[in-house]
């Protein structure tokens, strides 16, 4: 019996087609993805093949102005229109709290939303009961397929799920649910979830009875043969894991941002064993036309976005200096504003020992593309922020050793004075440079804000300690020459859309007046 699994993950609000790098579409003839194009391909496969499932492995939320404005209603509407069969909860589905998940998505979705390792407690338990499920048995042709969901157990550190949701270990939580499916005589089981490729592989290895793993979170691109675009494969598609009980389990993921549609064909024998698996992600490029009816619906929903981008978010009573003359040479108040917003967006009270789980921010000065003049009645709009942060990136959470951070700050000034973008703006860090010293030895003082303290204060950076840092995804991926970050990071979790982080902070503060306050000094 042959099953076709179509899958997406980490779409992150890319409802409209995008450029090849998943930023805003500029030249329509070269654009990719988007739900209208996705629908065309899905329908084409549904017409051609008998047993098809369309699955999403989480993180539909967060990433463009679509989410900022519609807050998840757009996800429910267009996923319903595409007739998704199931979705797993990702960490970003909790970005607007549990209410921001329940009302727009859980209550509106016409497909099951799954996670076996999220357990509700207290007053939330009855409120959310039945709105998401640990698993769902789906009829496919004459057969049934069990889909069991999972979500990153790190979600409380990455989003805002509140105190009434417990995120259990994925493997521990999945096994009893899979066992339950087996007792219901379901012998074809897909684990669909959002914990990253390493965890996906562990699930394939450790959870008895899982036949296929469809994952997300790590934006992993897998491909067999010559890849069709710029993404470099992390392995073959499907990636085969040998389970502890001796079975070959295919593991798949489909990069991110709706650029590809994962396409996996599985052949099962009469006992429910996977006897063959093959496929590849399908690049959703302009050779695939956008479906006219979905496109028309997108255009209708688009109108509200255009209105939103000119509305006032808040006010500034000072000039927001985002000029390259400042931000690539010294501390600039636009850099301070953005870093403060980044930390504020990551406030998660960990426990009594920690005031927060992260206190530090770094931001490449070259990523700040425009100032904002306060003399326009102080008004700040989304449109203004889009000029400051035009690249559609994310502000991510990484874990780095102190020694890696030291290298990063040396790189920040290794060719100082040439107006290059690698000069770092900071938050929760005090750095002193001596430019008279040779490159690679210019950082003379590097103090960082403690997290394991009730009163935050600055302590010298320890080379062997592991620190959490918020930074642009551009830096996490080694951009602007920060190869040491890419090579040495110990963990990387993608975060929220950059503009959204700053706009939310400005809306929250109402009036802002960031200063230059001695975060970066020269001796």
């Amino acid at each position: 019996w042959e099953l076709t699994i179509l899958h997406t993950n980490d779409v992150h609000s890319r409802l409209e087609q995008t450029s090849e790098d998943s930023s805003k579409c500029v030249n329509a003839s070269r654009c990719m993805g988007g739900v209208a194009r996705l629908f065309t391909k899905v329908q084409q496969i549904r017409r051609a093949e008998p047993n098809v499932l369309l699955l999403d492995a989480g993180d539909q939320y967060q990433g463009t102005i679509w989410f900022t404005v519609y807050k998840g209603a757009e996800v429910a509407h267009f996923m319903n229109a595409l007739r998704y069969d199931a979705m797993a909860l990702g960490n970003h589905e909790f970005d607007n709290g549990v209410e921001g998940l329940i009302e727009p998505l859980l209550k509106e979705a016409k497909f099951p939303i799954l996670s076996a390792n999220i357990k509700a407690k207290g007053p939330l338990a009855s409120q959310i009961s039945g709105l998401y499920l640990p698993y769902k048995v789906l009829p496919v042709g004459d057969e049934v397929v069990g889909i069991v969901g999972y979500t990153s157990k790190e979600t409380p550190f990455l989003s805002n799920p509140g105190t009434n949701l417990v995120f259990e270990d994925e493997i521990t939580a999945l096994q009893p649910e899979v066992d339950k499916l087996k007792t219901l005589n379901v012998n074809k089981i897909i684990a669909l979830g959002h914990s990253g490729f390493e965890t996906d592989k562990l699930i394939a290895q450790k959870v008895r009875g899982v036949d296929v793993v469809v994952g997300g979170h790590s934006n992993t691109f897998l491909y067999t043969g010559n890849p069709p675009s710029k993404e470099v494969p992390a392995g073959k598609y499907p990636f085969i894991v040998t389970s502890d009980d001796g079975r070959k389990v295919p593991v798949v993921q489909a990069y991110a941002f709706g650029k590809y549609l994962g396409y996996l064909k599985i052949e099962f024998d009469e006992r429910g064993n996977v006897i063959s698996s093959h496929g590849n992600p399908i690049l959703l490029n302009s050779s695939i036309p956008e479906d006219p009816s979905i496109k028309a619906d997108i255009n209708k929903w688009r109108i509200k976005l255009d209105n939103y981008s000119t509305q006032e978010l808040g006010k500034t009573i000072v000039y927001l200096d985002g000029s390259s003359q400042s931000c690539r040479f010294r501390e600039c108040n636009m850099g301070n504003l953005i870093c403060d917003a980044m930390i504020n967006n990551n406030l998660r009270h960990a426990d009594e020992m920690f005031w927060n789980h992260v206190s530090m921010c770094i931001l490449n000065g070259g990523g700040i593309r425009s100032p904002i003049d306060e003399r326009n009645n102080g008004t700040i709009t989304w449109e203004n922020l889009a000029a400051v942060l035009p690249f559609g990136g994310t502000f991510d959470l990484v874990q780095l050793k102190g020694s890696t951070l030291k290298k990063a700050f040396e790189h920040s000034v290794h060719r100082y004075g040439q107006s290059t973008g690698e000069f770092l703006q900071v938050g929760g860090i005090h750095v002193v440079y001596d430019l008279s010293r040779k490159p690679g030895d210019r950082v003379v003082k590097l103090d960082v804000l403690c997290t394991k303290c009730r009163v935050p204060s600055y302590d010298p950076l320890k080379m062997d300690e592991i620190y959490k840092v918020i930074l642009p995804n551009f830096l996490a991926n080694g951009g602007d020459g920060f190869q040491m970050i890419k090579d040495e990071l110990l963990r990387h979790d993608s975060g929220d859309q950059d503009i959204n982080v700053v706009s939310t902070y400005i809306s929250k503060m109402k009036v802002i007046y960031p200063a230059v306050e001695g975060r970066i000094k020269f001796s």
Epitope: W1, D142, K248, D269, E270, N273, I275, S276
Partner: antibody, heavy 112, light 107 residues
Framework: QVQLQQSGAEVVKPGASVKISCKAS????????INWVKQRPGKGLEWIGK????????DYNGNFKGKATLTADKSSSTAYMQLSSLTSEDSAVYFC?????WGQGTLVTVSA | DIQMTQSPSSLSASLGERVSLTCRAS??????LIWLQQEPDGTFKRLIY???SLDSGVPKRFSGSSSGSDYSLTISRLESEDFVDYYC?????????FGGGTKLEIK
């Protein structure tokens, strides 16, 4: 659990036909191919062909086209193989098989 | 048609010994290979599917692997019930084809 139960041994005359059956249980019969295999002592195993009961699709080994005819009855979850114009070369044990499970075999003896 | 050349055709070995049987495919079969065990009464049992996946209920002393066009079944420590016949079967392309079989005998 999955079971494939074949009909009993047959003794047939040369030139005649024989139809052997394979009743399936423990799974959705219409969703999986049923294979037929021939085993003769000292001749190893030969794949005859397969049938997809859901729509009756068949796929034959060229060596058995015209010799074997595969059919299936969804209502009784039974697959059939008819062998025609029998000769002594057709004397063998015939097995039906899924991908995982095999029938117990049916001995066909062609003898005058 | 894809030829499956199975070797050895017979093998004498002792209890507790480790043995390997090999099937060589004449064309690429993309790991679509089954190993079957046939009891003296004619009963077939599948041991391995998809080259290396172990069927449920099959002892872990059985394992399958591949290297290029060579596919192997290894029994790590022979037990008395293992002295029977073994066949490989490719299901990559029609007509499916079997190896000639290996008779495993006790020394």
């Amino acid at each position: 659990q999955v079971q494939l139960q074949q009909s009993g041994a047959e003794v047939v005359k040369p030139g005649a036909s024989v139809k052997i059956s394979c009743k399936a249980s423990g799974y959705v019969f219409s969703s999986y191919w049923i294979n037929w295999v021939k085993q003769r002592p000292g001749k190893g195993l030969e794949w005859i062909g397969k049938i997809f009961p859901g729509n009756g699709d068949t796929d034959y080994n060229g060596n058995f086209k015209g010799k074997a005819t595969l059919t299936a009855d969804k209502s009784s979850s039974t697959a059939y193989m008819q062998l025609s114009s029998l000769t002594s070369e057709d004397s063998a044990v015939y097995f039906c098989a899924g991908f995982a499970d095999w029938g117990q075999g049916t001995l066909v003896t062609v003898s005058a | 048609d894809i030829q499956m050349t199975q070797s050895p055709s017979s093998l004498s070995a002792s209890l507790g010994e480790r043995v390997s049987l090999t099937c060589r495919a004449s064309q690429d079969i993309g790991e679509r290979l089954i190993w079957l065990q046939q009891e003296p009464d004619g009963t077939f049992k599948r041991l391995i599917y998809a080259t290396s996946s172990l069927d449920s209920g099959v002892p872990k002393r059985f394992s399958g692997s591949s290297s290029g066009s060579d596919y192997s079944l290894t029994i790590s420590r022979l037990e008395s019930e293992d002295f029977v016949d073994y066949y490989c079967l490719q299901y990559a392309s029609s007509p499916y084809t079997f190896g000639g079989g290996t008779k495993l005998e006790i020394k």
